[in-house]
């Protein structure tokens, strides 16, 4: 429907205060090093001249896009070319090549200081001063460092971040109360941004083609009993509201996403019953509920699959009729039936049956030669299973962080020329998966773990991608979506890496380490544990496990100490030297 | 140190069978899995079979599942590939692994130890 000014259609649906929330969202997104008072002033500029849209819909600009609007005032930015380089060549393109480029200069690791929590009489000063500001910076700091967060998303959390404030600023013990809810927001908001990450680079890496296919797979489990016709409906909305926000266009986005969720609550009995609850809660709590509603009971007494799709003699007539939509069919039955495997396991099937109809169906006896596409399916099923059955079994036996460092020693021997801290936080994010999934039964551990470790690898996709330095990786990362946890678990050692030059620098520690927190110590072992590959690949595991067990205990050790600093410097030069003589470094 | 002795191999005729053995000697074989790797002429080494430290969980390459059975005995510290239905395909150096993990792992980097391996040539 044709809005004679689309600013301020978007204005009145959104109403003022999400409004300048995702304008504000916007810009960080896209100008992701400029100061706050910066994006507060363009932000009430840009709400200012909504206003006077909605006032009089034909006065001056009024009709002009908001792409157009909002590059105009980014491209007012005075510092753009000292701060940003080349972006600001962006600013002499036109409409729509101008948010093309400025998409393009989003950074997945930008330059930015991490962000130190203040004490928390200082955090419920500040929020009590003004709590307005107060909630704009978590916006603003949360967005620039995440340039693909979820924007309506986001808002629901800025929601649940004043609920924390507004609640334990009052409490008796304001620490006991806040400090959790924060670590809680701060580790859901890093996993929404991860999982937004992938469904970005699915669309803007693989196309919308590959985006639908994982629609279709995962509203086919969660909603087994909605008709084809139903899913294929919420699949193109759905489609519609991501590529919005990957595409910077958060009001659009956020108005698609909030008219996805009302049609979905008008319409709980075509698609699911346990919708109930959700449909309940206000437009925020509203939609993020939907989005992780559990899967509805699969409906009883499902005929077999390989009736329609191999026993029949209308296979190849029916796909050559409409492929996509053969193949969308395809995968919402197998998917409605199949809530125990992974998104990306019911992907390849589906890839592997549209890859025996295209040479089947131009062969001379098509049904002689599709005849057997299911037994096709075993292995690939049978793979991840393994994994992940080994997996959880050594996660049972180390625990997290032992894991994590089993992992560091089999990606950095995988990929070598990755820089440590990528290989440090991709291992540590892996390593989640144990006590993320392992503790889930058989049949929902597959879905838990797989499509957890998509995400997790897209991480290292993105960042390869900014500073490419693996042919390997890059390699799994493009070659296919879907395969790429396969592609990496089947690497090898890189037989090409020529091993770092030994830097005594590198294994050198200080009473530093003693007053770090658990997490932040393991941080620094773990850097260690990849330079230390890095230096001696072909180290084998029980190698490396003892020489990890007396730097635990060299640690340990020192930060008894009376003296810590001569402690480290002395029980160091003695541990680099007898770790050297064990690897033969 | 894990030694790792490798035995049985040699010629046999396509729809053969052989029995291939593994001896241990060292630390507590049973504290590791093992593992049956094999390359053939001009290719890389590839992944055969797998057994865990305890024996209740094996793993084949999809190329061998059905012919092959790995198994192990603990007591005797060693282990066996059971290669029956045997394919030219199956010509190769046999190589046996032990993993200090006791998963068994696909990959051969999980692998601390390694025997010298065993030819099979499977030829009419």
């Known amino acids: 429907d044709a809005h004679k000014s689309e600013v301020a259609h978007r204005f009145k649906d959104l109403g003022e205060e999400n409004f300048k929330a995702l304008v504000l969202i916007a810009f960080a997104q896209y100008l992701q090093q400029c100061p706050f008072e910066d994006h507060v002033k363009l932000v009430n500029e840009v709400t200012e001249f909504a206003k006077t849209c909605v006032a009089d819909e034909s006065a001056e600009n009024c009709d002009k896009s908001l792409h157009t609007l909002f590059g105009d005032k980014l491209c007012t930015v005075a510092t753009l070319r000292e701060t940003y380089g080349e972006m600001a060549d962006c600013c002499a393109k036109q409409e729509p090549e101008r948010n093309e480029c400025f998409l393009q200069h989003k950074d997945d690791n930008p330059n930015l200081p991490r962000l130190v929590r203040p004490e928390v009489d200082v955090m419920c000063t500040a929020f009590h001063d003004n709590e307005e500001t107060f909630l704009k910076k978590y916006l603003y700091e949360i967005a620039r460092r995440h340039p693909y967060f979820y924007a309506p998303e986001l808002l629901f959390f800025a929601k649940r971040y004043k609920a924390a404030f507004t609640e334990c600023c009052q409490a008796a013990d304001k620490a006991a109360c806040l400090l959790p809810k924060l670590d809680e927001l701060r580790d859901e908001g890093k996993a929404s941004s991860a999982k937004q990450r992938l469904k970005c680079a699915s669309l803007q890496k693989f196309g919308e083609r590959a985006f639908k296919a994982w629609a279709v797979a995962r509203l086919s489990q969660r909603f087994p009993k909605a008709e084809f016709a139903e899913v294929s409906k919420l699949v193109t909305d759905l489609t519609k509201v991501h590529t919005e926000c990957c595409h910077g266009d958060l009001l659009e986005c956020a108005d698609d996403r909030a008219d996805l969720a009302k049609y979905i609550c008008e319409n709980q009995d075509s698609i699911s019953s346990k919708l109930k609850e959700c449909c309940e809660k206000p437009l925020l709590e509203k939609s993020h509920c939907i989005a992780e509603v559990e899967n509805d009971e699969m409906p009883a007494d499902l005929p077999s699959l390989a009736a329609d799709f191999v026993e029949s003699k209308d296979v190849c007539k029916n796909y050559a009729e409409a492929k996509d939509v053969f193949l969308g069919m395809f995968l919402y039955e197998y998917a409605r039936r199949h809530p125990d495997y992974s998104v990306v396991l019911l992907l390849r099937l589906a890839k592997t049956y549209e890859t025996t109809l295209e040479k089947c169906c131009a062969a001379a006896d098509p049904h002689e030669c599709y005849a057997k596409v299911f037994d096709e399916f075993k292995p690939l099923v049978e793979e991840p299973q393994n994994l992940i059955k080994q997996n959880c079994e050594l996660f049972e036996q180390l625990g997290e962080y032992k894991f994590q460092n089993a992992l560091l020693v089999r990606y950095t021997k995988k990929v070598p020329q990755v820089s440590t801290p990528t290989l440090v936080e991709v291992s540590r994010n892996l390593g989640k998966v144990g006590s993320k999934c392992c503790k889930h039964p058989e049949a929902k551990r597959m879905p838990c773990a797989e499509d957890y470790l998509s995400v997790v690898l897209n991480q290292l996709c993105v960042l390869h991608e900014k500073t490419p330095v693996s042919d390997r990786v890059t390699k799994c990362c493009t070659e296919s979506l879907v395969n790429r946890r396969p592609c990496f678990s089947a690497l090898e050692v890189d037989e090409t890496y020529v091993p770092k030059e030994f830097n005594a620098e590198t294994f050198t520690f200080h009473a530093d380490i003693c007053t770090l927190s658990e997490k932040e110590r393991q941080i620094k072992k773990q850097t260690a544990l990849v330079e230390l590959v890095k230096h001696k690949p072909k180290a084998t595991k029980e190698q490396l496990k003892a020489v990890m067990d007396d730097f635990a205990a060299f640690v340990e050790k020192c930060c008894k100490a009376d003296d810590k600093e001569t402690c480290f410097a002395e029980e160091g030069k003695k541990l680099v030297a007898a770790s050297q003589a064990a690897l033969g470094l | 140190q894990v030694q790792l002795v490798e035995s049985g191999g040699g010629l046999v005729q396509p729809g053969g069978s052989l029995r291939l053995s593994c001896a241990a000697s060292?630390?507590?074989?049973?504290?590791?899995?093992m593992g049956w790797f094999r390359q053939p002429p001009g290719k890389e080494r590839e992944f055969v079979a797998s057994i865990n430290r305890s024996g209740d969980s094996t793993y084949y390459a999809d190329s061998v599942k059905g012919r092959f059975t790995i198994s192990r005995d603990n007591a005797k510290n060693t282990g066996y590939l059971q290669m029956s239905s045997l394919k030219p395909e199956d010509t190769a150096v046999y190589y046996c692994?032990?993993?200090?993990?006791?998963?068994?792992?696909?990959?051969?980097?999980?692998?601390?130890?390694w025997g010298r391996g065993t030819q099979v040539t499977v030829s009419s």
């Open positions: 692994a032990a993993d200090s993990d006791g998963i068994g792992w696909f990959n051969s980097f999980e692998y601390d130890y």
């Open positions: 060292g630390p507590i074989f049973s504290t590791y899995a």
